[in-house]
């Protein structure tokens, strides 16, 4: 007599998460008498998926009526597929007995589940950095299958190349995660810049997912300081201006010192934005020259975003007053003016 064959025609089947999977199985003979069972896996840890005789398998239904006489089709349909259903499924024929004896297995059908990656989440550095420094951005996406995935980084539309990407786990799994780090060199013009992490996967039908981060969260643009004297007023008062320009973020405190003593402290707020996203601020100090016998040393001290203070000093020459108003002043820089 011809040997019984258990035929599983598809070597592999790929299904989107949430859909149903049909696993086909036919036998070449009705003899010997005995049940068919479906297992996931071939080894000792194999899992019973469907047994017509007994058990409760709510997500599994036979494609043909298994009670029909002369039925040789033992295909099954598994509904609401999740990544956890991935694996190789075997249709197995048993010979009736006490107990039933395993007789022949099909070659197996590998079920792979296509699951969409989660929306990429981009996170930036914990602390701000200044221009010319390199900062790292991380992008993560989870829960996708199959493992093949493409991740690209862009800064203002230009693809970044200093990128390191890992897909985990390395071996076979029901679903996968991707983690990528991009290194970006900051420039002073990056306040309005944006990095984009773009993830492409077979489940997304050519419409990649994107995660974004603004470089404004990662950059600190230190201010330029300039102290100047306006022309002497008739009432013996000198108007000294401290111009603080091109800084970001807005968090800034300015202190005027007269001969080393604090004269006034101001906090920047509600400043108009420059086109490049930075801010400017101008502060004035009126100095009554006639109240001073000696030259007055004025210092504009700026603390920006919690960084060490930057000073710019200016000397008002009292001795020559009031005749040579324009030529009796000198400025000196007593701090480091970050650029």
């Amino acid at each position: 007599e011809e040997e019984l064959q258990v035929i599983q025609p598809e070597k592999s089947v790929s299904v989107a998460a949430g859909d149903s999977a049909t696993l086909n199985c036919t036998v070449s003979s009705l003899i010997p008498v005995g049940p068919i069972q479906w297992f996931r896996g071939a080894g000792p840890g194999r899992e019973l998926i469907y047994n017509l005789k007994e058990g409760h398998f709510p997500r599994v239904t036979p494609v043909s009526d298994p009670t029909k006489r002369n039925n040789m089709d033992f295909s099954i349909r598994i509904s609401n597929i999740t990544p956890a259903d991935a694996g190789t499924y075997y249709c197995v024929k048993f010979r009736k007995g006490s107990p039933d004896v395993e007789l022949k297995s099909g070659a197996g059908t590998e079920l792979s589940v296509r699951a969409k990656p989660s929306a990429p989440v981009v996170s930036g550095p914990a602390v701000r950095a200044t221009a010319e420094h390199t900062v790292s951005f991380t992008c993560e996406s989870h829960g996708f299958s199959p493992r093949d995935i493409t991740l690209k980084w862009f800064k203002n539309g230009n693809e970044l190349s200093d990128v390191q990407t890992n897909v985990d786990p390395a071996g076979k799994s029901v679903s996968y995660s991707i983690r990528s780090t991009a290194r970006v060199v900051l420039t002073r013009r990056d306040v309005h810049s944006q990095v984009i992490c773009e993830v492409a996967h077979v489940t997304l039908q050519g419409d990649p997912l994107r995660g974004t981060a603004n470089l404004s969260e990662a950059i600190r643009v230190p201010p330029f300081l300039e102290v100047t004297q306006q022309s002497m007023r008739a009432d013996n008062q000198v108007n000294v201006t401290c111009q603080v320009t091109k800084f970001y973020p807005q968090r800034l405190q300015l202190t005027w010192l007269e001969n080393g003593n604090v004269s006034r402290t101001e906090m920047a707020s509600a400043l108009p934005e420059n086109k490049d996203g930075t801010y400017n601020w101008t502060s004035w100090l009126l100095v009554n020259v006639s109240a001073h016998r000696d030259d007055v040393k004025l210092t504009c001290q700026v603390e920006h975003d919690g960084q060490p203070a930057v000073n710019k000093s200016f000397s008002v020459k009292v001795s020559a007053h009031p005749k040579e108003q324009g030529s009796n002043t000198a400025a000196e820089n007593t701090g480091t003016n970050e650029r």
């Epitope: 896996g41 080894g43 000792p44």
Partner: antibody, heavy 116, light 110 residues
């Protein structure tokens, strides 16, 4: 009750080789047979497994490089295109009456040498 | 791939002493207990010592003890005998239907 491997020999790279595992002394209601190899002075490397019905599965690295099949008297391991890295002692191991993936009966092994 | 990391790679102890070998899995083994331990001597096939993480195989002395669950497992050999000198391997079984081995631990008995 025993299993025994045979067919190991010196082969040239690319020449297919089939090893056989002969099972004797069992009332075979249910069993699993695994193929495992061990390169000289190295650890054990799992290749794949087959059950009494003939359903086989493989370690991911072994897919395409090996085929495990069952005849009426043996369980065969075919090395489809051997390379020198496949030089090893090949064991067949049986999981009999076990339900936790353990292999309680091992053959003595058969040596395969792949060399020009 | 699922990876079983055995530590240490080699351990030495005196007769009558105790040896502990650790086996860590990169993911949970099937049913949390598909973990076996084997002993292998040079030129011989492996011999099953423990299956189901903690069950002693037939004929194995109770000096051998397996413990652990999920991803972390331990083999303890107490009252060490000279005959215990061998290489010991752990083996896991996984839901993905593979049954890989750890890298092995050589036990030297002084």
């Amino acid at each position: 009750q025993s299993v025994e491997e045979s067919g190991g020999r010196l082969v040239t790279p690319g020449t297919p080789l089939t090893l056989a595992c002969t099972v004797s002394g069992f009332s075979l209601i249910s069993y699993y047979i695994s193929w495992v190899r061990q390169a000289p002075e190295k650890g054990l490397e799992y290749i794949g497994i087959i059950n009494i019905g003939g359903g086989a599965s493989y370690a991911s690295w072994a897919k395409g490089r090996f085929t495990i099949s069952k005849t009426s008297t043996t369980v065969d391991l075919k090395i489809t295109s051997p390379t020198p890295e496949d030089t090893a002692t090949y064991f067949c191991a049986m999981s009999y009456g076990m339900d936790t993936g353990a292999f309680n009966i091992w053959g003595p092994g058969t040596l395969v040498t792949v060399s020009l | 791939a699922q990876v079983l990391t055995q530590t240490p790679a080699s351990v030495s102890a005196a007769v009558g002493g105790t040896v502990t070998i650790s086996c860590q899995s990169s993911e949970s083994v099937y049913k949390n207990n598909f973990l076996s331990w084997y002993q292998q001597k040079p030129g011989k096939p492996p011999k099953l010592l423990i299956y189901g993480a903690s069950t002693l195989a037939s004929g194995v002395p109770s000096r051998f003890k397996g413990s652990g669950s999920g991803t972390q497992f331990t083999l303890t050999i107490s009252d060490l005998e000279s005959d215990d000198a061998a290489t010991y391997f752990c083996q896991g079984g996984y839901r993905t239907d593979i049954y890989p081995f750890g890298g092995g631990t050589e036990v030297v008995v002084k």
